[in-house]
Amino acid sequence: EPPTACREKQYLINSQCCSLCQPGQKLVSDCTEFTETECLPCGESEFLDTWNRETHCHQHKYCDPNLGLRVQQKGTSETDTICTCEEGWHCTSEACESCVLHRSCSPGFGVKQIATGVSDTICEPCPVGFFSNVSSAFEKCHPWTSCETKDLVVQQAGTNKTDVVCGPQDRLR
């Protein structure tokens, strides 16, 4: 009685169960009553990441530097190449097919979360008592200078974009 289902890592062909090719190898010929499945290793810059009966290996992903991409992890015969973005850039999608420049936080805003290869900068407004006077992808909001601790007084209040201006006590009105 010919089988209707095969074990794991096998496939049904011509009413018989053949072994699948292991990851990193492609199918050359199916097994017969007398021969095993014939598999061949994938070539340079190719891969197959599952037990398979593919007759062609997949091409490794190309990390195109013109799109701001670079290799994060080189592919093997069993794994695809993983791309990431150049410093200062991040992926536009999970597949990381292209990159865009990290956003900078404008004056009055600080960095809440620094960008990574896969996520953009997250900015937050500087609350009262803090400021940022630069456009930056790294700088957090800075606290206003405490004039009191320097034995000075506030001559001009700070804003979300400027620090407090301190002055000597005798300038107090």
Epitope: K112, V128, C147, Q156, A157, N160, L172
Partner: antibody, heavy 122, light 113 residues
């Protein structure tokens, strides 16, 4: 203890001005913000702006720019708010309150004056 | 400007009841650097000045009874009175102090049922 005492109620004609005072005691007046808040009859609270008496630095709610002017006299620990070109819509209780004390962590209003009722009526 | 929205606008309750007032801001009031929420709650009785109850969203002002508590983070905040007392019938306001201009919620009146 901290106390803010405001000037008495005023009745004013439309188009005139009024100056409300707020005398502070019990803390360092020059280094603490004085906040000004208004409450129209039966309405909620609205922030007008603030002044840091020692430096004269001010912050105004855009809505009240040109309407309110803040000054302070550190020799008498008194803050003032002048309201100009009065209209009937300016009828409200005006409060002063203490804001941050220079520590940059006390921006909430922990002490309030008793309020000054300004009535604008012809 | 940051908008503050309170609900409900009024609530009828009896002495001993648990009362919850919510306040929502149009922008997060949580600052990542100090992990503080820039929100205060005030109580106002008729003809009187408001009184500070809670600041930094959950810190009880000195002298305020422990039946008052504040919670929440980011954009959603709650003031809870665990067991309403006769002196608690008043109007309650939330206020942010994140950035100028400071703004208040429209108020919640707690009335006797």
């Amino acid at each position: 203890q901290v106390q803010l005492v405001q000037s008495g109620a005023e009745v004013k004609k439309p188009g005139s001005s009024v100056k409300v005072s707020c005398k502070a005691t019990g803390y360092t007046f020059s280094t603490s913000w004085i906040e000004w808040i208004r409450q129209a009859p039966g309405q909620g609270l609205e922030w007008i702006g603030s002044i840091l008496p020692g430096s004269g630095s001010t912050n105004y709610n855009e809505k009240f720019k040109g309407k309110a002017t803040f000054t302070a006299d550190t020799s008498t620990s008194t803050a003032y708010m002048e309201l100009s070109s009065l209209r009937s819509e300016d009828t409200a209780v005006y409060y002063c309150a203490r804001g941050d004390d220079g520590s940059y962590v006390r921006w909430y209003f922990d002490h309030w004056g008793q309020g000054t009722l300004v009535t604008v009526s012809s | 400007d940051i908008q503050m929205t309170q609900s409900p606008s009024s609530v009828s309750a009896s002495v001993g009841d648990r009362v919850t007032i919510t306040c929502r801001s149009s922008q997060s009031l949580l600052f990542s650097v100090n992990q503080k929420n820039y929100l205060a709650w005030y109580q106002q009785k008729p003809g009187k000045a408001p009184k500070l109850l809670i600041y930094w969203a959950s810190t009880l002002e000195s002298g305020v009874p422990s039946r008052f508590s504040g919670s929440g983070s980011g954009t959603d905040f709650t003031l809870t009175i665990s067991s309403l007392q006769p002196e608690d019938f008043a109007t309650y306001y939330c206020q942010h102090y994140y950035s100028y201009p400071w703004t208040f919620g429209q108020g919640t009146k707690v009335e006797i049922k």
